[in-house]
Amino acid sequence: RPSFSLVEDTTLEPEEPPTKYQISQPEVYVAAPGESLEVRCLLKDAAVISWTKDGVHLGPNNRTVLIGEYLQIKGATPRDSGLYACTASRTVDSETWYFMVNVTDAISSGDDEDDTDGAEDFVSENSNNKRAPYWTNTEKMEKRLHAVPAANTVKFRCPAGGNPMPTMRWLKNGKEFKQEHRIGGYKVRNQHWSLIMESVVPSDKGNYTCVVENEYGSINHTYHLDVVERSPHRPILQAGLPANASTVVGGDVEFVCKVYSDAQPHIQWIKHVEKNGSKYGPDGLPYLKVLKHSGINSSNAEVLALFNVTEADAGEYICKVSNYIGQANQSAWLTVLPKQQAPGREKEITASPDYLE
């Protein structure tokens, strides 16, 4: 028995299955509480840059400084964690770049320190002293076996030096590790000599080898990753997303839904709507409309952008995610204010997912 009346088809997957859908993995900036963080908006030719956090407009305050393409957060706290975006408005178009900020005392796994360190690992050599690659911090490499719960972030590091400065590449199970080998790809931070995989799934299990080489030699080190999970799971949605938002009539707003799934996720954005002046069908169930869903013709389904909003756009927006195992959904409310009222952050209400056991 469906719990709603369909205004548009809300079948689980698109009619044409997506061939290349990937879970988006924004750049992650990690800071310890109390530290300052500076991020540069990685967009070119920006006439005007606007910033959002969790889909809500971000303005300057006593801890947040916005200068040109830079965002500075002074004395970071865990409340500063979230999904940030900078939007570059140009004369003909606009473009948005997303990144995550994680203010935490410890990284999920694979390292004892966060990603703001590493400067000590980048050893500069006297240009005359030619030297084959060597490890600069073997303590960070002692733990070879990493047993990590699914959906966690894994970081492997191989801090090295040499002259000329060595290059680093990674192998998985002895073969070249390519971005397309895992949903969401991976990140290599050359300045930190690290490989980062977010939201690991069972197929990420295996041996990961860093190969560090220059013209005078090559060294390597292998880590073993075990992803601990005994049965496939329904999708997991990041708590607090999408976040409630408010804007004025004519304004723009974004809702973001962060998805972790070890099986292909299908994302739908759904809104309660009226049909013939009624919010409910003859059966007493609410009318719902699918605003966006993942598929061949849909880009970045995790983000729902609304432009030039009207009062009719106010209401509840549902992010519904499914894989072959099950579903999850979370929702947020959009408040549309009259033109004279400035938008403000609403009291946050995190909708409970519907799959609690």
Epitope: T11, V201, S322, Y355
Partner: antibody, heavy 113, light 107 residues
Framework: QVQLVQSGAEVKKPGASVKVSCKAS????????IHWVRQAPGQGLEWMGA????????SYNQRFKVRATLTADTSTSTVYMELSSLRSEDTAVYYC??????WGQGTTVTVSS | DIQMTQSPSSLSASVGDRVTITCRAS??????LNWYQQKPGKAPKLLIY???NLADGVPSRFSGSGSGTDFTLTISSLQPEDFATYYC?????????FGGGTKVEIK
Amino acid sequence: QVQLVQSGAEVKKPGASVKVSCKASGYIFRNYYIHWVRQAPGQGLEWMGAIYPDNGDTSYNQRFKVRATLTADTSTSTVYMELSSLRSEDTAVYYCARAFTYWGQGTTVTVSS
Amino acid sequence: DIQMTQSPSSLSASVGDRVTITCRASENIYGALNWYQQKPGKAPKLLIYGATNLADGVPSRFSGSGSGTDFTLTISSLQPEDFATYYCQNVLSTPYTFGGGTKVEIK
């Protein structure tokens, strides 16, 4: 423990319909897709469709979209698969499965004039 | 639809042999692949999910590998109870297509 118990064998004439049931127990019924897979004699496995009992969402293989109907009764933790306009090539064993991890014992449907 | 091609379609092996079955997807399915074992008159049994992860209650002699388009199921030392038909399945997107099956017979 998780169990899926299917209804008994059926013999149908061409053009008729058949409704196979799958009763689930041992887990929270609403929280997992129930998939239907069929296997013709001596052949491989073919996915037909799935239903999410919590809200009745369905997804079908295009080959069966017109003829197959999946429904769920949360009060009895039972899913039904109805296949209409039967033809001889629909003779097969029909399985229900919870997210492909746990499977029913299968229901044999024979279509013969 | 994503096509799944298994090879070989059948093989003969002896107890204790190492057996390898391959599965190729017509397009990149990342690690979204399951392996099943089926014995005559019985329902399929999940062996491996997510390409590499052993399902509950499955002996460790079974292992899965691969990602993208090429996948392998390996039985390290074939046991008498392993003689059966094995199927791979795409679980990336609907329709969730199966491979044609590989029948493992006694030599």
